[in-house]
Every structure is written in C-alpha cells, then in structure tokens.
C-alpha cells in the first residue's frame, strides 16, 4: 500500500510586498479519503489559509483547475502580499470523519519571508 507523502518542495520562499506568492504542495496518493487544507503556523492557534470546500478566501487561488479529476496538486497562490503574511505555511491532509474530519498528515512547511525590494 502506498503511504501518503505530502510534498512541499521549498523550505523558504522569499516574496515581495504587493506581489503574488505561490506555495507548492503535491501528494502521492488520493488516500485516505478527505480534504487538503492550508494553514499558517501550527497548533490550536494556527490560521486557516485555504479550504476549497467552504469559506471565503479572496486573495487565494488554486494552481490546479478545480474541475480536474483526481487532483494531486494542492498548490495555492496568495496575491497582494503584505508583511503580515510572513510565517510558515503547511498543507495538511485530513482523513474523513463523521462528523469531524481528523488531521492525518502535514507537509514539512514552507517559510514565507520578505525578500529585498527590487531597486
């Protein structure tokens, strides 16, 4: 049985204020059944960055087409970056539960930091 791997290839992503940042996340299996969500930070105080199923995330778009079948690319773009966006971002696989989904596996995280302003 193939064990699910959550792949976030960049450990560090340098971004520019006002620009768009792309956070990459791919998975190696569709299993277990359940959604992938993006968070900033860890623990109970972590911030939900994107949930495709519900919520409103006006600055976030998905890299892959949402009508694509059997998608394994859960990368996102965050537009209009501000200094408040810095932090470590995690894509997290949840296992479907009833009534609540249960966290199954997290990616290693990508730290978003501000790079030098272009001159």
């Amino acid at each position: 049985e193939e064990e699910l791997q959550m792949i976030q290839p960049e450990k560090l992503l340098l971004v520019t204020v006002g620009k768009t940042a792309t956070l990459h996340c791919t998975v190696t299996s569709l299993l277990p059944v359940g959604p992938v969500l993006w968070f900033r930070g860890v623990g109970p105080g972590r911030e939900l960055i994107y949930n495709q199923k519900e919520g409103h995330f006006p600055r976030v778009t998905t890299v892959s087409d949402l009508t694509k079948r059997n998608n394994m690319d859960f990368s996102i773009r965050i537009s209009s970056i501000t200094p408040a966006d810095v932090g470590t971002y995690y894509c997290v696989k949840f296992r479907k539960g009833s009534p609540e989904n249960v966290e199954f596996k997290s990616g290693p995280g990508t730290e978003m930091a501000l790079g030098a302003k272009p001159s």
Partner: antibody, heavy 120, light 108 residues
Framework: EVQLVESGGGVVQPGGSLRLSCAAS????????MSWVRQAPGKGLEWVST??????YYADSVKGRFTISRDNSKNTLYLQMNSLRAEDTAVYYC???????????????WGQGTLVTVSS | EIVLTQSPATLSVSPGERVTFSCRAS??????IAWYQQKPGQAPRLLIY???SRDTGIPDRFSGSGSGTDFTLTISSLQSEDFGVYYC??????????FGGGTKVEIK
C-alpha cells in the same frame, strides 16, 4: 481500460453470509477509494460502503453487518455480508471512486454487478 | 442525510426532442452533484460531475447546470440510445452518499 468484475453473488437464506469480490484492472488500484453500491429489483441506487486506505464508511442500513476490505496486492475489493436480510436482496455494483477539486467523491467506473438474493 | 428529489419520475419523449431533468437537494450541496445514466440490465454510467463537467467520451448533447439546491441535466436532442433511467448523486456531505430516485425516459 478500466475493468471491474464482481463475483460471489448467489442465493442465501436470511441470517446467512456471503462474500463478494471485485477484481480491478486498468488503473492504479491502491491510490483510489473504492465503493459498493446496490440496487434492489426495480428500485433506485443505494450506496452501501466505501474504503479508502484503511478508512471505511458504511450506510446505516448495513453498519455492523457488512465489512468492506481491499487487497492491493491482488487489486481486489471485497464485501463481507453477514446476518443477511430479505431487504439486502439487490444487484451489488463495485465502483471506482473519483475525486474532483480538493475533495468530493463520485463513481466514474462501475462493474456489471452481481445479484444477491436473500430468501428462505 | 441530504435528500435528493428528482422530477418528473417518468418522461415520455420522442427522438430529437430536448429533455430536461430536475434534481433538488434538501440542503445546499454547492456544485457537488453527479449525473448517471442507466440502461436496462446495465450498470450506471457517469455522465456529469461537479454539476456541469462532462465525463470523458460523453456527447456534448448532454449538459448539466445548477448550484446550491437546484440542478438540471439537459439532453439537447434525444437520441434513441439515450432512453433509460437518469440518477443524480450528491457528494457534498457524506456518509451517506445519496442518490435521487431517478427519472425514467420512455419513448413516446
């Protein structure tokens, strides 16, 4: 080409047991969820059970009586049916799950079905 | 459990006619609806997923629309091979996956 071939159906008495099998080919079986859907004679479709990796889901009507399992080394899906009742009489279809977007499952390939008749 | 209600239960139509099927959900299911066709003695066949995306190999006379609670499957010009029963299915909130009761398309 995706193929799903069910077997194991037949006539069984109320309270009896039966084990259905579904042999899958033409796709990477181990990374997809798989399901059983049934159809009573002249009736509509009713979802029975789904299995992911080792995560399993059941309709209330079969919970505690039916067990879904899979053998990825054999590309085979199973449904163990115990304590069978007359209302379990149906054609049982094996179906491959497909996802769209970031979650949400439907059934993109179906087997031809195997008939289970529960009768004394 | 989300209940799907399909109407009408039966449609009598002639080849070449435009056919519209309705599927209404008891609560918001976003666009998480699939449509299947089943011919007598055969397994169901996926036609539409995500409310409006045609499956591979499905003719473009089949189209789906709707979101929230009201969904429609349309066959723009019914062909003789299109007769059968059509089911909608929701996958927004499960278990359980639920299906509508089906709409049977008969020859007029």
């Amino acid at each position: 080409e995706v193929q799903l071939v069910e077997s194991g159906g037949g006539v069984v008495q109320p309270g009896g047991s039966l084990r259905l099998s579904c042999a899958a080919s033409g796709f990477s079986f181990s990374i997809y969820a798989m399901s059983w859907v049934r159809q009573a004679p002249g009736k509509g479709l009713e979802w029975v059970s789904t299995i992911g990796a080792d995560d399993t889901y059941y309709a209330d009507s079969v919970k505690g009586r039916f067990t879904i399992s899979r053998d990825n080394s054999k590309n085979t899906l199973y449904l163990q049916m115990n304590s069978l009742r007359a209302e379990d009489t149906a054609v049982y279809y094996c179906a491959k799950d497909s996802t769209v977007g970031w979650s949400g499952d439907f059934f993109d390939y179906w087997g031809q079905g195997t008939l289970v008749t529960v009768s004394s | 459990e989300i209940v799907l209600t399909q109407s009408p239960a039966t449609l009598s139509v002639s080849p070449g006619e435009r056919v519209t099927f309705s599927c209404r959900a008891s609560q918001n299911v976003r666009s998480d609806i699939a449509w299947y066709q089943q011919k007598p003695g055969q397994a169901p066949r996926l036609l539409i997923y995500a409310a409006s995306s045609r499956d591979t190999g499905i003719p473009d006379r089949f189209s789906g629309s709707g979101s929230g609670t009201d969904f429609t499957l349309t066959i723009s010009s019914l062909q003789s091979e299109d007769f059968g029963v059509y089911y909608c299915q929701q996958y927004y909130d499960w278990p359980p996956f639920t299906f509508g009761g089906g709409t049977k398309v008969e020859i007029k």
